[in-house]
Amino acid sequence: QDCSAQCQCAAEAAPHCPAGVSLVLDGCGCCRVCAKQLGELCTERDPCDPHKGLFCDFGSPANRKIGVCTAKDGAPCVFGGSVYRSGESFQSSCKYQCTCLDGAVGCVPLCSMDVRLPSPDCPFPRRVKLPGKCCEEWVCDEPKDRTAVGPALAAYRLEDTFGPDPTMMRANCLVQTTEWSACSKTCGMGISTRVTNDNTFCRLEKQSRLCMVRPCEADLEENIKKGKKCIRTPKIAKPVKFELSGCTSVKTYRAKFCGVCTDGRCCTPHRTTTLPVEFKCPDGEIMKKNMMFIKTCACHYNCPGDNDIFESLYYRKMYGDMA
């Protein structure tokens, strides 16, 4: 390729590349161009995406004009039940563009993560999911005395309106977090979840933690004292190590568990806290997981029915969680 001529670029400004496509210098080191992707035609002037391990395969050494972007040998990826070649890009959903690179999947958001600050034209901006739209969009809650096209001439006083509690706002985000759900298992290791937007971009996210209401192997009914029908929080004689998928907690824990009743009532966690627990796996890998620790249990008749899809609210929620 002859690069002796003076650099001449198609546009003054660098082009805007689609999400997940790298902006690279052309073969002459002159102009910034959008890199060609896996399977696309390439030339020395239009290079392949180096960040995805792609190279321009010209086939025979004699042909140095046009090639095809090919992946350097790398491990494929399994994602959402599909197999992708190394260097291959795909849309995991309407919100994310992903790329497989040597066994690892990296994704970039297709939806704007923009933040909107209040202004006279939009005093209470909110992000909402609109029907038929993939990405959330900004909407402005209009005060009653606004004109059809812009701010009203009469000074509209923000302090005279009722909005969200300003102490709960973080950079225009009304922080909301649901209660933790009930543990997915009545005995043994399960999962408890909640939804929150308590993060940098005020985005709803699902959080999960491990939970164990009681060990499965414990025969707790034996410990119920004569004349009593329940054992709410049985004493666990010795500290325990938790197990998760063949991995064992590094530390031992004197954890509280919930007991059982003989009169049809069930005992579930009432007040809980969340703490990180480190697990060591046979291959030496250490993984850290958040786990529920029980402070108090409650015994009640609001037990989940076998076919009841609307499990009782009491059973579904964890109250008074500290974290």
Partner: antibody
Framework: EVTLKESGPVLVKPTETLTLTCTVS????????VHWIRQPPGKALEWLAV???????DYNAAFMSRLTISKDTSKSQVVLTMTNMDPVDTATYYC????????WGQGTTVTVSS | ETVVTQEPSLTVSPGGTVTLTCRSS?????????ANWVQQKPGQAFRGLIG???NRAPWTPARFSGSLLGGKAALTLSGVQPEDEAEYYC?????????FGGGTKLTVLG
């Protein structure tokens, strides 16, 4: 990525009309308004006009008779015209997004001289 | 004509706290003035730091806070860093138009 870019003539003659274009990307003009602001050499910022997300407009009273702001949402462009230019209008002209003036263009320098 | 006044210049030591203010010539600044604070570092573009009196932009560090103090809009920098040296402008909304202040040149000693 949110960007705003001003374009227009570098030099205009006194009494001529200045037309500046602000081309935006990364957001929609139906969702955010756009402001025009200028800064004469060595001086402070001076707010000129705004076109709101729903098409309404507001102007600096000192320039109201000379300014017109409009937008083409489909082209993601906001246009400001300023008539009867004078050497005192020599300045760097900026467009900025509504909502805390969070994003600004790099500015375009306009010199008014015969 | 409404005038918005800022301190022309302020000097602060690294790690110190400084408050920039924005005064309106026609009375106390309120939340309906939607006070905005804009920063320009030498050789860089302008960017908004605070909007609607006290709301930080996503890139604005937590050491910057906007508020109303004694009838004025205020921008407080706590634990000032050398990179905070810049020109700061406030802008106030008056029902039909914005007015920018004259700007404050913040110098960080060091």
């Amino acid at each position: 990525e949110v960007t705003l870019k001003e374009s227009g003539p570098v030099l205009v003659k006194p009494t001529e009309t200045l037309t500046l274009t602000c081309t935006v990307s990364g957001f929609s003009l139906s969702t955010f308004g756009v402001h025009w602001i200028r800064q004469p050499p060595g001086k402070a910022l001076e707010w000129l006009a705004v076109i709101w997300r729903r098409g309404g407009t507001d102007y600096n009273a000192a320039f109201m008779s000379r300014l017109t702001i409009s937008k083409d949402t489909s082209k993601s462009q906001v246009v400001l015209t300023m008539t009867n230019m004078d050497p005192v209008d020599t300045a760097t002209y900026y467009c900025a997004r509504d909502g805390g003036f969070d994003y600004w263009g790099q500015g375009t320098t306009v010199t008014v001289s015969s | 004509e409404t005038v918005v006044t800022q301190e022309p210049s302020l000097t602060v030591s690294p790690g110190g706290t400084v408050t920039l203010t924005c005064r309106s010539s026609i009375g106390a600044v309120t939340t309906s003035n939607y006070a905005n604070w804009v920063q320009q570092k030498p050789g860089q573009a302008f960017r908004g730091l605070i909007g609607g009196t006290s709301n930080r932009a996503p890139w604005t560090p937590a050491r910057f806070s906007g508020s109303l103090l004694g009838g004025k809009a205020a921008l407080t920098l706590s634990g000032v860093q050398p990179e905070d040296e810049a020109e700061y402008y406030c802008a106030l909304w008056y029902s039909t138009h914005y007015v920018f202040g004259g700007g404050t040149k913040l110098t960080v000693l060091g």
